[in-house]
């Protein structure tokens, strides 16, 4: 039994942290294999976590942690048994994929006006809770063309629009993600898309 | 109320041992890092020993190696440190510490401290 | 083994004024892992910042840490009376435990 594909980490720097490998074959990850792990850091101790089957030779293991400092480092040792298969280290901090945002909600009543709101995936005594920013994705379902992304750049998690930059009497849906710019991180997953009907009064026309 | 509550100080002639105790109340002993500071009569905070959630790992200052043992008894919510060979310089107020995880090393839970007098 | 000195030894300070406790480490470590204590006679130690600048619960916001590297700082920004006492900081690291020998902050 061997490694094809080394492990590789990403953290959500907050409790998780999801490392993924390939066995050069067939493995029942949750049976045959275990990562070790253990935070570098006068008497932490080992943590075991039992891996899930991530494709036929692919494996999985979501690594559970207290929190999240930038200096962490920990040490990962990959088990079948016991023979050692796979040494390594990483650092939380600079694998970051942030939490997908949720709770996104579309407030049509404003004067014409689309009003964007989600919730912060994480607590304010989070690091990464005043870094984030966000890109919201809208689309139409009636025509895939209309496809378009804003980024939102400031720290508030919301987004006004003018209803009328949009198509009337059509639905469209929505999702947002984030990134945190001070670790360099991957984009979030999107968050659950949510629906609505766009209408809006047209101006009158003058003649 | 979080409290831990050393004891078992007192006068001891230099070589000989002294076992000190510290009960926890008010949390689970077993989800925290415990360790023993101590104080000498007008000086500083010194570090003396430290042991691991499960007693796995334990860890000494340089000046106490080879003479203390540190131990713990987590379903009794218990720690202790066994002193043998003890010298004038241990004289001191030894406290009682816990450490949060999340603090990362802050010592955010202290005992009042038991005194540990050598002398002959 | 990391070495931290705490400068001032004695700090001579009037209430209201603004205090500044320096703490240098013989090499450059983590900021996660400095914290800071205060100490009155007779008592235990309590714990101010850890993380170098995050209070611990509890703790008034004219107490405040920062620093990076090899240089640390312990501000209180208006001195109280309940305030003059003992400060320590203290690197809790990977591999050691080690204290700076104090500051006394006394009244003026």
């Known amino acids: 039994m061997k490694v094809l594909q080394e492990p590789t980490c990403v953290s959500d720097y907050m409790s998780i942290s999801t490392c993924e490998w390939k066995m050069n074959g067939p493995t029942n990850c949750s049976t045959e294999l275990r990562l070790l792990y253990q935070l570098v850091f006068l008497l932490s101790e080992a943590h075991t976590c039992i891996p899930e089957n991530n494709g036929g030779a692919g494996c999985v293991c979501h690594l559970l942690m207290d929190d999240v400092v930038s200096a962490d480092n920990y040490t990962l040792d990959l088990w079948a048994g016991q023979q050692l298969l796979w040494k390594g280290s990483f650092k939380p901090s600079e694998h970051v994929k942030p939490r997908a945002p949720g709770n996104l909600t579309v407030h049509t009543n404003v004067s014409d006006t689309l009003l964007l709101t989600w919730s912060n995936p994480y607590p304010p005594d989070n690091y990464l809770y005043n870094h984030l920013t966000y890109a919201v994705n809208i689309w139409s379902e009636n025509d895939p063309a209309d496809f378009r992304i804003y980024n939102v750049t400031y720290l508030e998690p919301s987004l006004r629009i003018a209803a009328s930059t949009l198509k009337s009497g059509i639905s469209y849906r929505a999702r947002v993600r984030a990134w945190a710019q001070c670790y360099n991180t991957t984009w979030s997953e999107w968050s659950p898309s949510t629906k609505w009907h766009n209408s809006y009064r047209e101006p009158f026309e003058q003649h | 109320e979080v409290q831990l509550l050393e004891s078992g100080g007192g006068l001891v002639q230099p070589g000989g041992s002294l076992r000190l105790s510290c009960a926890a109340s008010?949390?689970?002993?077993?989800?925290?890092?415990m360790h023993w500071v101590r104080q000498a009569p007008g000086k500083g905070l010194e570090y003396v020993s430290g042991?691991?959630?499960?007693?796995?790992?334990?860890y000494y200052a340089n000046s106490v190696k080879g003479r203390f043992t540190i131990s713990r008894d987590n379903p009794k919510n218990t720690l202790f440190l066994q002193m043998s060979s003890l010298r004038a310089e241990d004289t001191a107020v030894y406290y009682c510490?816990?450490?949060?995880?999340?603090?990362?090393?802050?010592?955010?839970?202290w005992g009042q401290g038991t005194t540990v007098t050598v002398s002959s | 083994e990391i070495v931290l000195t705490q400068s001032p030894g004695t700090l001579s300070l009037s209430p209201g004024e603004r205090a500044t406790l320096s703490c240098r480490a013989s090499?450059?470590?983590?900021?996660?892992?400095l914290a800071w204590y205060q100490q009155k006679p007779g008592q235990a130690p309590r714990l101010l910042i850890y993380?170098?600048?995050r209070r611990a619960t509890g703790i008034p916001d004219r107490f405040s840490g920062s620093g990076s590297g090899t240089d640390f700082t312990l501000t209180i920004s208006r001195l109280e009376p309940e305030d003059f006492a003992v400060y320590y900081c203290?690197?809790?690291?990977?591999?050691?435990?080690?204290f700076g020998q104090g500051t006394k902050l006394e009244i003026k």
């Open positions: 510490v816990r450490v949060k995880r999340r603090y990362r090393g802050g010592m955010d839970v």
């Open positions: 008010g949390f689970t002993l077993s989800s925290y890092a």
């Open positions: 042991i691991s959630h499960s007693g796995n790992s334990t």
């Open positions: 090499q450059s470590v983590s900021t996660a892992y």
């Open positions: 993380g170098t600048s």
């Open positions: 203290q690197l809790y690291g990977a591999t050691s435990v080690t």
